[in-house]
């Protein structure tokens, strides 16, 4: 009876996600057969989050909208380890929007999920950010410094990275 009700709950939760994520990839968390964590197929997973590299070229606003219709946000990078994971799936000759912007052009950077902007956990390329008209952040590759962040005009179409919390069933 307990197993039956757990299965019913799982099915109803899966139905919630079906519109945008018809297929989920789930792994068993820990030793308990009851606890599964899932990411939409073909998203990748790291710690408690799922990531998707969007290859369509869009402005920052539309990139964020694209993520949001999938139940995600543009990526918020909280640690060096997280960035190191993300860059494994990026192409060196492309740039990708992050969920970081400076809407007023006053160098008050803010993350889309309201995570406080911590200057100590940022990975700007040297000399960046450097232009008040460039109010959105990308991650890109520079041969001299490897992967890092750069400010860019928000209307210039780029690829992007979406991030969402893992789905627990």
């Amino acid at each position: 009876n307990f197993m039956y009700s757990k299965t019913v709950k799982r099915l109803s939760k899966l139905r919630e996600y079906q519109q945008y994520h018809p297929s989920l990839t789930c792994v068993m968390e820990g030793k308990d057969i009851e606890d599964w964590s899932c990411c939409p197929t073909p998203w990748t997973s790291f710690q408690s989050s799922c990531y998707f590299i969007s290859t369509g070229m869009q402005s920052w606003t539309k990139s964020q909208k694209n993520c949001s219709v999938m139940g995600a946000d543009l990526v918020v990078i909280n640690t060096r380890e997280e960035q190191d994971f993300i860059i494994q799936n990026l192409k060196r000759n492309s740039s990708y929007f992050l969920g970081l912007s400076d809407p007023g052009g006053r160098r008050h950077w803010q993350w889309v999920d309201q995570t406080p902007y911590n200057e100590n956990v940022t990975f700007w390329h040297s000399g960046e950010p450097n232009n008040l008209d460039e109010r959105c952040a990308i991650i890109n590759f520079r041969s001299s410094e490897e992967w890092g962040w750069n400010d860019i005009h928000c209307h210039v179409p780029q690829k992007s990275i979406c991030k969402m919390k893992k789905i627990y069933i």
Partner: antibody, heavy 118, light 107 residues
């Protein structure tokens, strides 16, 4: 007032290149991105690509990739669109357009007719 | 790439008529749609953006509606200066494709 003034009409032979200019005035040149759109005679409109004058970042329509190059000269507030390996089907009016704060084309140049003929 | 299909390609109407032009996208463009008016030998002029927001200086007889993949431009009472060609354009992702155009002619 905002103005985009384009260079004059050009006649080119197949295989040649053409460089069309678009001089901006009436606003801060480096604050808005510029797009290029073309229109063949009696036909519809076709988006070619965009350039951010502040840093020169570009994004091109794949259809023209390898043939189109967009550049800018901040000292004269001018953007350029160069199309190479011209063929007769490139005969068109070429427009530059500014993308406004609302992310739509709010101002357009007057257009430049490029004729490709042997 | 998202394709934009505009219909009709041409129509004949009289001054005072109500005119409707439709634009269908091959995918959801989330209301990121503009409508332009173009007269012979001139550059296009922005009429509406975000599917339904009137651009500055555009008369209120022009209106737009729609969502998802289907959008409409309506001219409530056609005026002599409205005879022109109308284009839709999406701005969801590149390439920012245009519809094929609708020529509005005098009946």
């Amino acid at each position: 007032q905002v103005q985009l003034v384009q260079s004059g009409a050009e006649v080119k032979k197949p295989g040649a290149s053409v460089k069309v200019s678009c001089k901006a005035s009436g606003y801060t040149f480096t604050s808005y991105i510029i797009h290029w759109v073309r229109q063949a005679p009696g036909q519809g409109l076709e988006w070619m690509g965009t350039i951010y004058p502040g840093r020169g970042d570009t994004s091109y329509n794949q259809k023209f990739k390898g043939r189109v190059t967009m550049t800018r000269d901040t000292s004269t507030s001018t953007v350029y669109m160069e199309l190479s390996s011209l063929r007769s089907e490139d005969t068109a009016v070429y427009y530059c357009a500014r993308m406004g704060d609302n992310e739509y084309f709010d101002y357009w140049g007057q257009g430049t007719l490029v004729t490709v003929s042997s | 790439d998202i394709q934009m299909t505009q219909s009709p390609s041409s129509l004949s109407a009289s001054v005072g008529d109500r005119v409707t032009i439709t634009c269908r996208a091959s995918g959801n463009i989330h209301n990121y749609l503009a409508w332009y008016q173009q007269k012979p030998g001139k550059a296009p002029k922005l009429l509406l953006y975000d599917a339904e927001t009137l651009a500055i200086g555009v008369p209120s007889r022009f209106s737009g509606s729609g969502s998802g993949t289907d959008y409409t431009l309506t001219i409530s009472s056609l005026q002599p200066e409205d005879f022109a060609t109308y284009y839709c354009q999406h701005f969801w992702s590149t390439p920012y494709t245009f519809g094929g155009g609708t020529k509005v002619e005098i009946k």
